[in-house]
């Protein structure tokens, strides 16, 4: 609940906001979670803390890890975790899924593509935009403030859009890129009763005690942009956020729009350090829209580690 995934590319600037908010906040302290070592606030450091923000100027692959932020006030201290992953730059044009921000949809009337996370940075215009790695040219494309406007949107405008900008910190410039998919709304879209693709109903998922486990809830809701559609996990009939087990968190997966036009959503349930008691819980994958709610139940069972000695008996 108080953890947030952030990602970036090596040699680019990455700024991460503490996922906990102060109510109010007086100071924010940042630590390397593994070592509990305090992150400096002096700006001469490549990685430094600045209030609610943690800055990597620039980021290195070795910076990947979990960072702890503690928001302090006279009343309560609140702890959050930033899970940071820094990736090597791709040599080819293909942007992998793990570097993609949430998909946005557009239509003839509304075709704004916002540059993800840009509000965290000290940037100045112009913002550069690329589609499938090609710089956008032509009067149909207008870079306006922190978003791109496409005039007369057509289905061919769907694709991966990358914004590139410069972050300035104390006179030094750092490059930042962010990519998200853009889909064009099919005006002939429709909505169906949710169809859960995974997990199967009453599925038994084998897990190893002490290891991490992921369960994916995936459902489709119709074709085109859906007015209301959601997938979520419940534990013993309780929302994950209310269940109160910090080891078990849900995380939005990729919004999907398959070649057949189906609009689908994923929600990943991450269980850290699986414990015996987790096997007793009922895991419900819920998919709901205006038509109703569908539920698939999963239970966990213990996966017996292979006894290597017995193989040779």
């Amino acid at each position: 609940k108080f953890s947030k995934q952030s990602w970036g590319l090596e040699n680019e600037a990455l700024i991460v906001r503490c996922p906990r908010q102060g109510k109010p906040s007086y100071t924010v302290d940042w630590y390397y979670s593994q070592t509990n070592k305090s992150i400096p606030t002096q700006e001469r450091n490549r990685v430094f803390a600045s209030g609610q923000l943690l800055k990597f100027l620039p980021a290195a692959v070795a910076d990947s890890g979990i960072y702890t932020c503690i928001v302090r006030s006279p009343t309560f201290n609140r702890t959050g975790y930033a899970n940071v992953t820094i990736y090597k730059k791709q040599s080819d044009c293909n942007v992998p899924d793990y570097l993609m921000y949430s998909t946005v949809s557009g239509s003839e009337k509304n075709s704004k593509i916002y540059c993800p996370t840009i509000d965290l940075y000290n940037w100045t215009a112009p913002l550069e935009w690329f589609k499938n790695c090609q710089a956008l040219q032509g009067s149909r494309y207008r870079a306006h403030k922190s978003f791109l406007v496409i005039d007369n949107v057509m289905t061919e405008d769907a694709g991966d859009y990358t914004c590139k900008f410069i972050h300035n910190e104390n006179g030094a410039n750092y490059s930042v890129t962010a990519t998200r998919s853009f889909t064009v709304k099919d005006e002939q879209g429709f909505s169906l009763f949710p169809v859960i693709g995974a997990p199967a109903q009453n599925e038994i998922k084998e897990v190893e005690i002490g290891k991490n486990a992921n369960l994916t809830c995936s459902a489709c809701f119709g074709k085109g942009t859906q007015f209301l559609a959601a997938v979520l996990w419940q534990l013993n009939g309780t929302k994950i956020t209310d269940f109160g087990e910090p080891r078990i968190q849900q995380e939005e997966g990729q919004n999907q729009s398959f070649s057949n036009g189906l609009a689908c959503l994923d929600m990943v349930l991450r269980i850290a350090d699986v414990k015996e008691e987790d096997l007793l819980l009922q895991y419900d994958c819920l998919a709901l829209n205006l038509h109703g709610l569908r539920r698939h139940t999963v239970r966990l069972s213990r996966k017996n580690p292979i006894d290597h000695h017995s193989i040779y008996c």
Epitope: K23, T75, F76, R78
Partner: antibody
């Protein structure tokens, strides 16, 4: 707009317990701490304690510790303040007051008068 | 606990007057983050207090610019540049630097 609506006036006997409610609307309840402040007749303001509705964590002023319990019900966006072992000097108006990300005591309820009399 | 002492406890003034209320804290209200956690509230009879000024000198939303506040770590002043009929009320200073949060005893501004 933000509103904090408190329960009505109460008359209690010495030694009794009073529980006051404070229903919040117009903002996300768990995004704000809820504090309680006492004001005795013709007197000033005295901070009693607070709750973080998101976690249920509480903190109390020494003067009231042991007698005051602050709780919150996320489902109804309502905070409660319970004061036990009432004595005549507890006769006062009690206010709930919410914080923002910038400061405490940003929003106030209308106040609840509690009269302790035998 | 930090003690907040206001003076005067009451004053009489006329509409249009410049009014000054002082508040002293027993400890500096300057936090290591550079913010002074001094607040001013206005309270009218039978009503809840209303935030006027936060963090020494910031006007709360909707508060007229005739209200201003200044001060150092321990000595503070609330000024009403030109008193209006709706300003007759009791004014409290408060500190939110550390627990327990404490208030001044109040200054009642009455019509002369």
């Amino acid at each position: 707009q933000v509103q904090l609506v408190q329960s009505g006036a109460k008359v209690k006997k010495p030694g009794a317990t009073v529980k006051i409610s404070c229903k919040a609307s117009g903002y996300i309840f768990i995004d704000s701490e809820m504090h309680w402040v006492q004001q005795a007749p013709g007197k000033g303001l005295e901070w009693m304690g607070a709750i973080d509705p998101e976690t249920g964590d509480t903190v109390y002023a020494k003067k009231f510790k042991g007698r005051v319990t602050i709780t919150a019900d996320k489902s109804s966006s309502t905070a409660y303040m319970e004061l036990s072992s009432l004595r005549s000097e507890d006769t006062a108006v009690y206010y709930c007051t919410g914080s923002t990300t910038d400061y405490y005591f940003a929003y106030w309820g209308q106040g609840t008068l509690v009269t302790v009399s035998s | 606990d930090i003690q907040m002492t206001q003076s005067p406890s009451s004053l009489s003034a006329s509409v249009g007057d410049r009014v000054t209320i002082t508040c002293r804290s027993s400890k500096s209200l300057l936090h290591s983050n550079g913010i002074i956690y001094l607040y001013w509230y206005q309270q009218k009879p039978g009503k809840a207090p209303k935030l006027l000024i936060y963090q020494l000198s910031n006007l709360a939303s909707g508060v007229p610019s005739r209200f201003s506040s200044s001060g150092s770590g321990t000595d503070f002043t609330l000024t009403i540049s030109s008193l209006q009929p709706e300003d007759f009320a009791t004014y409290y200073c408060a500190q939110n630097l550390e627990l327990p949060f404490t208030f001044g005893q109040g200054t009642k501004v009455e019509i002369k």
